[in-house]
């Protein structure tokens, strides 16, 4: 595929990445799949600046990110190392709370109303943010 050099229509460029901000809600898995179909992934927050940028665009609304612990340890969807990376959890989070009565714990991370992170039930229909890196090979065939 060809190298993507600018962001698609309706995506926002920031620091060599493109971001798309949903205005509807989906379960985490559906949001993850939506981003993949766009040749992207749920947003991976790797720095203070990226946190601030995303927070600025989503406002005070619960919004999924590309972080989960559905298979045990916390993992970013693009393979970025969780342990050594940027974190912005709310105090006492993540807590894998079982008291919601929906079965199981809380395995998916989202931005809360103040931008800090919380783990929640993955089935909740939250907004989401997709991210794709510029300079990475696109799956689309090159234009002739």
């Amino acid at each position: 595929g060809s190298e993507r050099t600018c962001c698609p229509v309706n995506w926002v460029e920031h620091e060599r990445s493109c971001y798309w901000f949903s205005r509807s809600g989906k379960a985490w898995a559906d949001a993850d799949n939506y981003c993949r179909l766009e040749d992207a992934h749920l947003v991976v927050v790797t720095s203070w600046e990226e946190q601030k940028f995303v927070q600025h665009h989503i406002g005070p609304v619960n919004t999924w990110m590309g972080l989960h612990d559905q298979n045990g340890p916390w993992k970013w969807v693009d393979g970025t190392d969780y342990e050594t990376g940027f974190k912005n959890w709310r105090p006492e989070q993540p807590d894998d709370w079982y008291g919601h009565g929906l079965g199981g714990g809380e395995d998916c991370a989202h931005f809360t109303d103040d931008g800090r992170w919380n783990d929640d039930v993955c089935q909740r229909p939250y907004r989401w943010v997709c991210e794709t890196e510029l300079d990475k090979a696109s799956q689309e065939p090159p234009l002739l």
Epitope: W48, K52, F53, F86, K87, N88, W89, P91, D114, G115
Partner: antibody
Framework: QVQLVESGGGVVQPGRSLRLSCAAS????????MHWVRQTPGKGLEWVAV????????YYADSVKGRFTISRDNSKNTLYLQMNSLRAEDTAVYYC???????????WGQGTLVTVSS | DIQMTQSPSSLSASVGDRITITCRAS??????LNWYQQKPGKAPKLLIY???SFQSGVPSRFSGSGSGTDFTLTISSLQPDDFATYYC?????????FGGGTKVEIK
């Protein structure tokens, strides 16, 4: 009301070490990030370092990186700044400040003066 | 690092005057700009955060505006208690940086 009280300042020779403390009260210390900010006499403000509420992230100004270490003891409601290899240009009033919204200082201590001089 | 440039560095004004202090960032900081007031021998006090939000207890004569690189702090009717030094500060990116300050003096 929220109170932050710094201590540990004083006169120290260049190359020596000093540890500042900041005792917090009247809020849930373990729920807030904390900063150190300094002000040279008669001059402006310079951010020094920040530590997350749980210690998971720390950031430093380039001017102190590798020499200063920020830490906290949530069980004692206390913030620390270990200052090694002190230089004359580290002379300043050092304030601790509570973090609100990732990088906003909503409450400040009264400051403690550090003088680095031979 | 993001440089914050404040102007003017000092100004003289009278009680009742409307004054404006400007702050310019060397790159976009979105709306992540805070304003502080400092009196001699005292710690700074937060007035405005994220460019235009009032800290609790701050009088309504103080207001902030701007986004991107250009920001302003306005005092609509200067009061005796307002004679102090004012600093802007960006919280978008570490290292967090302050403007050089604006000293507001009595004319």
């Amino acid at each position: 009301q929220v109170q932050l009280v710094e201590s540990g300042g004083g006169v120290v020779q260049p190359g020596r070490s000093l540890r500042l403390s900041c005792a917090a009260s009247a809020f849930t210390f373990s729920s807030y990030g904390m900063h150190w900010v300094r002000q040279t006499p008669g001059k402006g403000l310079e951010w020094v370092a920040v530590i997350w509420h749980d210690g998971s992230n720390k950031y430093y100004a380039d001017s102190v990186k590798g020499r200063f270490t920020i830490s906290r003891d949530n069980s004692k409601n206390t913030l620390y700044l270990q200052m090694n290899s002190l230089r004359a240009e580290d002379t300043a009033v050092y304030y601790c400040a509570r973090d609100e919204q990732l990088g906003t200082f909503d409450y400040w201590g009264q400051g403690t003066l550090v003088t680095v001089s031979s | 690092d993001i440089q914050m440039t404040q102007s003017p560095s000092s100004l003289s004004a009278s009680v009742g005057d409307r004054i404006t202090i400007t702050c310019r960032a060397s790159q976009s900081i979105l709306s992540y700009l805070n304003w502080y007031q400092q009196k001699p021998g005292k710690a700074p006090k937060l007035l405005i955060y994220v460019a235009s939000s009032f800290q609790s207890g701050v009088p309504s004569r103080f207001s902030g505006s701007g986004s991107g690189t250009d920001f302003t702090l306005t005092i609509s009717s200067l009061q005796p208690d307002d004679f102090a030094t004012y600093y802007c500060q960006q919280s978008y990116s570490p290292p967090l940086t302050f403007g050089g300050g604006t000293k507001v003096e009595i004319k």
